[in-house]
Interface confidence: low
Amino acid sequence: LPAQVAFTPYAPEPGGTCRLREYYDQTAQMCCSKCPPGQHAKVFCTKTSDTVCDSCEDSTYTQLWNWVPECLSCGSRCSSDQVETQACTREQNRICTCRPGWYCALSKQEGCRLCAQLRKCRPGFGVARPGTETSDVVCKPCAPGTFSNTTSSTDICRPHQICHVVAIPGNASMDAVCTSTSPTRSMAPGAVHLPQPVSTRSQHTQPTPAPSTAPGTSFLLPVGPSPPAEGSTGD
């Protein structure tokens, strides 16, 4: 004969367990039904009656099968530097993530608690490590033969153009100015060039990226101009 199906509430076998989506009620000493996501336990079970579930109210949720006495409050509305990537529903909490140009300086279980603006590398500095959802941009000084003339959170140090005849030598924040009508641009930092008469340095080796600051610390630093080693605008 097939085993008899037990309907909740029922007493578990000694040392046995309740089934999936059931819990053991300590007072009733019975296996009772959990409530599905989007609901909560309005009335706990007894020896003779099962759990009574009710829908979550507006702005509250339960994400799991549960037996909680009230639904959880959805998180507060997303701040101006955030985007709501998941709305608050009866079955899920609101999730806020940082908008473009910002990163999460203080994360929470889902989404972000505090966003901070990505560091901008000032002229003479380029991006050594781009920003991610959870880490800030790392800036580095432009190596000899490279420059950056922008204040940007995305621009890297670019190689100087290579002049046959140089009018103004390039530096870390300015490209070389050529008198020749047809300047050439080196392919990339570290590119090998065929021997040719050039007036500027063509040593374009890529420096080692500077060590990253701990993610989520920059927003705590005092506002003001950054020391040159940081290569940050300080905004």
Partner: antibody
Amino acid sequence: EVQLVESGGGLVQPGGSLRLSCAASGFSFTNNYYMCWVRQAPGKGLEWVGCIYPSIVGPTYYANWAKGRFTISRDNSKNTLYLQMNSLRAEDTAVYYCVRDRYDDYGDYFNLWGQGTLVTVSS
Amino acid sequence: DIQMTQSPSSLSASVGDRVTITCQASQSIYNYLSWYQQKPGKAPKRLIYYASTLASGVPSRFSGSGSGTDFTLTISSLQPEDFATYYCQSNSGVNGNRYGNAFGGGTKVEIK
């Protein structure tokens, strides 16, 4: 770093009141977590005081001996848990621990403890 | 409130010994039981939950068993860092919080 830091302990006279605070950091305090208080008298065992449900309005659950004199509350905007203790007695002298618990059945019971704050009730 | 009775209250043992601590609940708590280790001046550390599930980072020499009212914590081979006080605790989840999260009286494991 995920941590709980208690404060507000100290010397208080019998019959007096004291409010303990527990500042939570490194995790989402607002949702998912029951927050509880456990105490330990000098040289004695652990004693459960009570817990509060994740939302601001409760509900709260207390050990029988704590009902009426002790009140647990939380300020989710400050990520802080409180224990208001009234009509204090000498036997309430203990280290009071703030503890994190889960609202669901992930088995994440009492898995994060603060360092404790000492309350001494004496005249 | 549920009462948790732990025994023995203290024991002396040597490194390498097998140690067993028992805990009895005043009513059935199914498998909603945790074990903690506490060292002097420190907060307790959770070792086991759901009666037999080892918490993250806890050495496998610790094990738990039992269901209903009778539970056991076993240390298969006692190590120097295991000399401490051990507590059991009833914790039956949200619904169970209405009936308390009672601790046992503790078992102090000392060096023989």
